[in-house]
């Protein structure tokens, strides 16, 4: 009876989760109900005695199919080209770091770090992002100047809503500029890079929200927030893109013990967003203008906007006082790019549908690793590629566009039996000439099967060997696009394939 009841509950809870998804309930609500469903299923499993081993990837991870990899490679290509265009070098660091390296760098997010089980040696943790390892790398190598990019997987013990492109193992694409430079020039370049990449990817309209940690801290100070509560109130403010001010206020007052009038004063500020005119307006604010930190931050933002205008991206940037990125290491400018969903009603503002890139200035992080506390100013950005992959994949599915998963230029086929040796010789010649070529691994494949494979794989050309053609010293070259078939002299084949696939001269 107990098992039957549990089974019914699993069925009901499953239907409940599906219903919530259809109603487009909040991610957190869906996540909680999915967690409940998993707990119910686990109880069912325990009830069976020994649980059956289910073949699956761990929670929050996924495999990439060839189609998904093709999408991913294209996205990475756009990003890497942009990073290189801006003169970045590339580095790599270990997937795991000493636990101590990551400790105390992420504030409230530290609970999401994966610690490795102690094997009797060093205490290790999987990297949570690429920024802290970068700071460790700079300090360790006593570097004071570098412009680098780093693309690698990071690990977070989040409870991810994987449908929204969030995972426990995911790629980050980081670009950072380390060094002592004149204010806001590297910061502006980071924003320019972010805009270039997001525009190139053509994933839709986006907006980059900009703020400054010093403005936030100054604002909290003038509003009467105790120093000890700055960071925790910051994380509440950062939720404003997801929940209403009322809910944020309730959290500040009810859970974090802030006085309601202090919360109201914060509310007057954090609900404002605009451009350079808002920066100027706040510089005149009777309270903020008396706070040194806030004035410094506002002064830098004013300068930043001047550079953004010169870079031609000021229309993509919004100064948003509610932006309060959760990581503890930011010290100056912070920014976050969100994809915009166009408004359903005329006159409404476009709606942000999740962060796709973010970053900021972190001048103190390297100093945390330096025995003498020497600081190396840094500013950088991170592209949220997993979310971008999801968006691109969804778009491709909707358009039913065919995605090529190989780069093969030509399939080597034969029209008659007993021509395996000739096919092997020809495909080898093509490989040696740097042509991407394939053949079917059968001694006597049917021509129809070969042509079917050629079409399905989206290979542009097929080279068909026949007995007559061999005698005449030619190969039939057929194009998938034009359907035309031409006889090409064997010695001209490589050149003809190159010409038809616009491939420059290259060898292995």
């Amino acid at each position: 009876a107990d098992r039957a009841a549990l089974e019914e509950l699993v069925r009901l809870q499953g239907a409940h989760v599906r219903g919530l998804k259809e109603q487009k309930a909040s991610a957190e609500q869906i996540e909680e109900e999915v967690t409940k469903l998993l707990k119910l299923k686990a109880q069912l499993g325990q009830d069976e005695g020994k649980q059956k081993f289910v073949l699956k990837t761990p929670k929050g991870t996924r495999d990439y199919s060839p189609r998904q990899m093709a999408v991913r490679e294209k996205v990475f290509d756009v990003i890497i080209r942009c990073f290189k265009r801006h003169g970045a070098e590339v580095i790599d660091t270990p997937v795991f770091e000493l636990k101590e390296t990551l400790t105390g760098k992420y504030g409230e997010d530290s609970k999401l770090i994966y610690d490795l089980k102690d094997q009797g040696g060093e205490l290790l943790s999987l990297r949570y992002d690429l920024t802290v390892p970068f700071a460790r790398y700079l300090a360790m190598n006593k570097l004071t100047n570098i412009k680098r990019y780093h693309i690698a997987k990071v690990y977070r013990r989040d409870n991810p809503a994987m449908t929204r492109g969030r995972y426990r193992e995911f790629y980050q694409c980081d670009f950072d500029i380390a060094g002592q430079f004149d204010p806001m020039i590297p910061d502006a370049e980071c924003l320019k890079i972010m805009c270039e990449i997001l525009s190139s990817l053509q994933i839709g309209n986006f907006l980059v929200k900009v703020n400054d940690r010093r403005i936030l801290d100054g604002m909290f100070a003038v509003c009467g927030v105790p120093d000890s509560k700055f960071r925790t109130i910051c994380s509440s403010v950062d939720k404003l893109d997801k929940v209403s001010w009322e809910e944020v206020k309730n959290e500040m007052v009810g859970e974090k013990g802030l006085a309601p009038e202090v919360a109201d004063r914060i509310g007057d500020y954090v609900q404002q967003h605009g451009g350079v005119s808002l920066v100027e307006q706040l510089l005149q604010d009777p309270k903020l203008s008396q706070n040194k930190q806030a004035v410094e931050g506002l002064g830098d933002l004013k300068l930043l906007f001047e550079y953004l205008i010169l870079f031609g991206i000021d229309d993509k940037i919004s100064f948003d006082l509610s932006l309060a990125r959760g990581l503890d290491y930011y010290t100056g400018v912070i920014y976050e790019a969100v994809l915009l969903q166009m408004p359903t009603q005329a006159g409404e503002e476009p709606l942000g549908v999740g962060s796709i890139a973010a970053g900021g200035r972190y001048d103190g992080l390297v100093g945390m690793f330096d025995p003498k506390g020497r600081k190396v100013p840094c500013v950088g950005l991170s592209i949220g590629v997993e979310r971008i992959f999801s968006i691109v994949e969804q778009r491709l599915e909707a358009s039913e566009e065919k995605v090529r998963t190989t780069e093969t230029q030509v399939l080597v086929a034969s029209a008659q039996k007993k021509l395996l040796e000739e096919r092997l010789k020809l495909v080898s010649e093509l490989w040696d000439a740097g042509i991407k070529a394939e053949l079917l691994y059968k001694k006597n494949p049917k021509l129809l099967n070969q042509l079917q494979y050629w079409e399905e794989a989206g290979i542009p050309l097929v080279a068909i060997i026949g007995e007559q053609e061999l005698r005449d010293g030619v190969i039939k070259l057929r194009s998938v696009a034009s359907r035309e078939e031409v006889d090409v002299r064997r010695e001209d084949l490589v050149e003809e394939i190159r010409r038809r696939t616009n491939q420059p001269l290259s060898t292995c």
Partner: antibody, heavy 120, light 107 residues
Framework: QVQLVESGGGLVKPGGSLRLSCAAS????????MSWIRQAPGKGLEWVSY????????KYTDKVRGRFTISRDNAKNSLYLQMNSLRAEDTAVYYC?????????????WGQGTLVTVSS | DIQMTQSPSSVSASVGDRVTITCRAS??????LAWFQQKPGKAPKLLIF???NLESGVPSRFSGSGSGTDFTLTISSLQPEDFATYYC?????????FGQGTKLEIK
């Protein structure tokens, strides 16, 4: 056997605070969602708040949100309800209750209740 | 919030009688409904969960049925210990709400 024992109730003036505790035994406390349900004298039952097994999720009814805070200490097998800015309408017997099958919002085990009286 | 309405608010019956109490939800709640029994000065006791499942240790004279918005608790043959107040509760969405109660009295 499953046992839930509430404590911390009493008489308090409007605007005052109280902290209710619930000691759990006889089951793996850290596996279960837990809740506080109250019943005003001579009235019906009202679900006040709940907390998930690992404290990731908490919810409150509109009447108490911003004033009450639910928390738990799995190491001590204890559930708590911090009640601030108390009002006369918060007067009730407060029951600590365990979720059915760990996660279903139906209370399959209840404490004996602790009376909270808010009066000047 | 989902409103739960019980009827009747009180009922008088004798030992051996068959008694039916109904509960209506203001919107569909699938089978997310429970029935509780409460005696004066005591905590409620779970009788039925997800509309029709009998909680272990509860006598089989208690049964539940319904789905969507209309639900029923039936006691097939009243026993002296069954005189109490009965509550229904929806567990579909927070805030989880109870009916106003049905008092079952001795005739």
């Amino acid at each position: 056997q499953v046992q839930l024992v509430e404590s911390g109730g009493g008489l308090v003036k409007p605007g005052g605070s109280l902290r209710l505790s619930c000691a759990a035994s006889g089951f793996t406390f850290s596996d279960y969602y837990m809740s506080w349900i109250r019943q005003a004298p001579g009235k019906g039952l009202e679900w006040v708040s709940y907390i998930s097994d690992k404290s990731r999720y908490t919810k409150y009814t509109d009447k108490v949100r911003g004033r009450f805070t639910i928390s738990r200490d799995n190491a001590k097998n204890s559930l708590y309800l911090q009640m601030n800015s108390l009002r006369a309408e918060d007067t009730a017997v407060y029951y600590c209750a365990r979720y059915l099958y760990q996660v279903i919002a139906i209370a399959d085990a209840w404490g004996q209740g602790t009376l909270v009286t808010v009066s000047s | 919030d989902i409103q739960m309405t019980q009827s009747p608010s009180s009922v008088s019956a004798s030992v051996g009688d068959r008694v039916t109490i109904t509960c209506r939800a203001s919107q569909g709640i699938s089978s997310w409904l429970a029935w509780f029994q409460q005696k004066p000065g005591k905590a409620p006791k779970l009788l039925i969960f997800v509309a029709s499942n009998l909680e272990s240790g509860v006598p089989s004279r208690f049964s539940g049925s319904g789905s969507g918005t209309d639900f029923t608790l039936t006691i097939s043959s009243l026993q002296p210990e069954d005189f109490a107040t009965y509550y229904c509760q929806q567990a579909e969405s927070f805030p989880y709400t109870f009916g106003q109660g049905t008092k079952l009295e001795i005739k």
